[in-house]
Interface confidence: low
């Protein structure tokens, strides 16, 4: 029986932990009955052959955040019971090809954040029990064919942040049990047809932060169990018809930060379980009818930071469960009165940072549960009578940074805002832009003695742009809704009100990026 090395702490449960920059060589002697050994944050640079000979009961070895640059080929000899090995966050450039030959019962092998430049084809040949292999954050420019062929039990493989430019289409062909494959933060520009065909149990595929320009039509056709697909921040300009046809279990799809110009009807579907679709930061200019009609469980649709100038009236058909719709920071000038009609469960809609000149009176007619509407920074001069009257749950309405025309036509909106001031938030209130006599004054607190209607040029909406109030039988004016006050700021979801630079962070990070 060995005692505990002076630079380590040992518990009765056979756990040994050695930490600290003062440790420059492998501590010894190690207790013969050690089952867990952690060597963390030391200055150890080398692992000799003889340090683990007498601790054959070891099950977990964690050597992380050291200066480890050199491991002798027989360093892990006699560790036949080892199940978990982490060498992450060291300075390893190469691994001896037979380094792992005696630890063939490993279940997890973590090699992330080293400086590995290559993996030998036979490096992992004896790991039939391996469940997780982490190679994130190395310098592997190429994965040789056959390197994973014996890892038949592997369920999680992370190859992110390495820098490969291409993949052999055969490299994953024996990984039928793989559930998570992370290839993000590389330089992949093209993924050959068939690369993922053997991965029938795959649940997560992370391909974000690459340079992928095109997707082969059948690339995901064998991945019927896929639940999360991350394709954001690539160079994808076109989605082939049918690309997502065989993904009935998909519940998250990220496509933001690409070069998509259009969405053909039916490209998304059928995906009955998709809950979130992230399409911001693309170059989409219009949305056709039925663009999302197969996504009847979709709850979040993010289309902000595109170049949308036209949305077909039936673009959102089928989205009966949508809760959040983000359309901000586009080039919208007009919206059809029926565009949101099928969105019966919509809670939050963001339309800020567009060029909207007017809104149809019926725009929110069927969206009775709306809680937040963001209309700031548009070209609105007035709003139709009764437009918000039926929205009993509305608790956040942002109207500032619009060129409000404060003549007598604004009175109904002014009166409604007085009664519903709490819904406007406390940050910025809407301000009159014209006529000159009231420019800069708050639309909410301005004196009600407005000037008469100004003479309007052809570019200005006529008063007739107000709908007939008979379309709302329960309301006689825009001010008929009783005031709603909020006791807390946590009652609602504040959707996408941050500046564009933050939008990427709020809507862009994925679980996959944590490795």
């Amino acid at each position: 029986y060995y005692g505990c090395p002076s630079e380590c702490t040992c518990s009765r449960a056979s756990q040994v932990e050695c930490t600290g920059a003062q440790i420059v060589a492998m501590p010894s002697p190690l207790p013969w009955n050690a089952m867990s050994l952690q060597i963390l944050n030391t200055h150890i640079t080398e692992l000799p052959e003889d340090k683990f000979l007498n601790i054959s009961a070891l099950i977990a070895l964690k050597m992380e955040k050291n200066e480890l640059a050199n491991i002798m080929p027989g360093a892990f000899r006699n560790l036949g019971s080892l199940r978990h090995l982490s060498l992450a966050n060291n300075k390893l450039k190469n691994l001896p090809v037979r380094l792992f030959q005696d630890v063939n019962n490993l279940e997890t092998l973590l090699l992330s954040n080293n400086q590995l430049v290559q993996i030998q084809p036979a490096q992992f040949s004896q790991f039939s029990n391996l469940k997780e292999l982490q190679l994130y954050g190395n310098n592997l420019e190429y994965i040789p064919e056959g390197v994973f062929d014996h890892l038949v039990g592997l369920t999680k493989l992370n190859l992110g942040n390495n820098g490969f430019t291409h993949l052999s289409p055969r490299v994953f062909q024996h990984l039928g049990n793989l559930q998570v494959l992370r290839l993000y933060e590389n330089r992949l520009s093209d993924i050959p047809m068939g690369t993922f065909d053997a991965l029938g149990n795959l649940q997560e595929l992370a391909l974000q932060e690459n340079q992928i320009g095109t997707l082969s039509p059948g690339l995901f056709h064998n991945n019927r169990n896929l639940q999360r697909l991350y394709l954001s921040n690539n160079h994808i300009s076109h989605l082939p018809p049918g690309i997502f046809m065989q993904l009935p279990h998909l519940n998250k799809l990220t496509l933001f930060g690409n070069s998509l110009k259009e969405l053909s009807p039916g490209v998304f579907g059928p995906m009955p379980n998709l809950r979130e679709l992230w399409l911001y930061n693309n170059h989409i200019t219009s949305l056709p009818d039925n663009a999302f009609s197969h996504l009847n469980q979709l709850q979040v649709l993010i289309l902000s930071h595109n170049q949308l100038s036209y949305i077909s009236p039936g673009a959102f058909n089928g989205l009966t469960n949508l809760r959040e719709l983000s359309l901000h920071t586009n080039a919208l000038q007009d919206l059809d009165g029926n565009v949101f009609r099928s969105l019966a469960n919509l809670r939050n809609v963001s339309l800020q940072n567009n060029r909207l000149r007017q809104l149809p009176g019926s725009i929110f007619a069927n969206v009775n549960g709306l809680m937040t509407i963001q209309l700031q920074n548009n070209n609105l001069e007035n709003l139709p009578l009764g437009i918000f009257d039926h929205l009993g749950n509305l608790c956040e309405l942002r109207l500032y940074d619009n060129p409000w025309r404060c003549d007598s036509n604004i009175l109904p909106l002014h009166d409604w805002l007085i009664l519903n001031r709490a819904r406007l938030g406390t940050d910025t209130l809407p301000v009159c832009s014209s006529p000159a006599s009231v420019r800069g004054q708050s639309l909410v607190i301005i004196n009600v003695n407005f000037p008469g209607p100004s003479v309007q040029g052809p570019e200005t909406p006529e008063v007739s742009s107000y709908p007939d109030t008979s379309s709302y039988p329960d309301s006689t004016s825009i001010s008929s809704t009783t005031e709603i006050t909020r006791s807390t700021d946590d009652d609602y979801t504040d959707l996408n009100t941050i500046e564009p630079i933050d939008d990427r962070n709020t809507w862009g990070m994925t679980d996959a990026q944590s490795g």
């Epitope: 050959p192 053997a198 064998n222």
Partner: antibody, heavy 116, light 107 residues
Framework: QVQLQESGPGLVKPSETLSLTCTVS????????WSWIREASGKGLEWIGY???????NYNPSLKSRVSISVDTSKNQFSLRLKSVTAADTAVYYC??????????WGQGTLVTVSS | EIVLTQSPSSLSASVGDRVTITCRAS??????LAWYQQKPGKVPKLLIY???TLQSGVPSRFSGSGSGTDFTLTVSSLQPEDVATYYC?????????FGQGTKVEIK
């Protein structure tokens, strides 16, 4: 052992449709892709197109307007149809297993002559 | 489409000679290149894929090299049974394309 066998008429009249079937044995058609390739006399090898068991296809643009490839997974077969043939379509037609590019197993080939 | 140009079109060499065939792609195809051997009256046979990986059962005297646009097939010691036409094939992007072939004969 994986084997592929082409079958179909050896003589087709000009302007008619060439139809061939490839029967796969020793392997499931539900894995990999399945291609047709032809070799005209003195012309070398020309890839015609492939089919995936899901029905997905990809064709050589030079033939795309005339060709269709289909799959019958229940019979472990895939088929080629080439419309409006001319004498230039006379060739040995091979079916092959397409392992995402390289063709590792080929049929024996069948000579199709286009002649009236 | 990617055009593959083989050279030479034909060659004649003695048994035991080292023979080299080159294949040039019209644009970069990484290592997505295969080589085939077709003996007279026979079916093409896959020799090498991924530019340099020997297909199972192929004699070790065959080897491949190259990446990007320039590729080489080498027979280290030519044997009588190696008389055939050799084709390179691109599988980087569809349409898959073949070189025009190189005919190898024995002197």
């Amino acid at each position: 052992q994986v084997q592929l066998q082409e079958s179909g008429p050896g003589l087709v009249k000009p302007s008619e449709t060439l139809s061939l079937t490839c029967t796969v044995s020793g392997a499931s058609i539900n894995i990999y892709y399945w291609s047709w390739i032809r070799e005209a006399s003195g012309k070398g090898l020309e890839w015609i197109g492939y089919v995936h068991h899901s029905g997905g296809t990809n064709y050589n643009p030079s033939l795309k307007s005339r060709v269709s490839i289909s799959v019958d997974t229940s019979k472990n077969q895939f088929s080629l149809r080439l419309k409006s043939v001319t004498a230039a379509d006379t060739a040995v037609y091979y079916c092959a297993r397409d392992t995402y590019g390289p063709f590792d197993y080929w049929g024996q080939g069948t000579l199709v002559t286009v002649s009236s | 489409e990617i055009v593959l140009t083989q050279s030479p079109s034909s060659l004649s060499a003695s048994v035991g000679d080292r023979v080299t065939i080159t294949c040039r792609a019209s644009q970069g195809i990484s290592n997505y290149l295969a080589w085939y051997q077709q003996k007279p009256g026979k079916v093409p046979k896959l020799l090498i894929y991924a530019a340099s990986t020997l297909q199972s059962g192929v004699p070790s005297r065959f080897s491949g090299s190259g990446s990007g646009t320039d590729f080489t097939l080498t027979v280290s010691s030519l044997q009588p049974e190696d008389v055939a036409t050799y084709y390179c094939q691109n599988y980087y992007s569809a349409p898959w394309t073949f070189g025009q072939g190189t005919k190898v004969e024995i002197k």
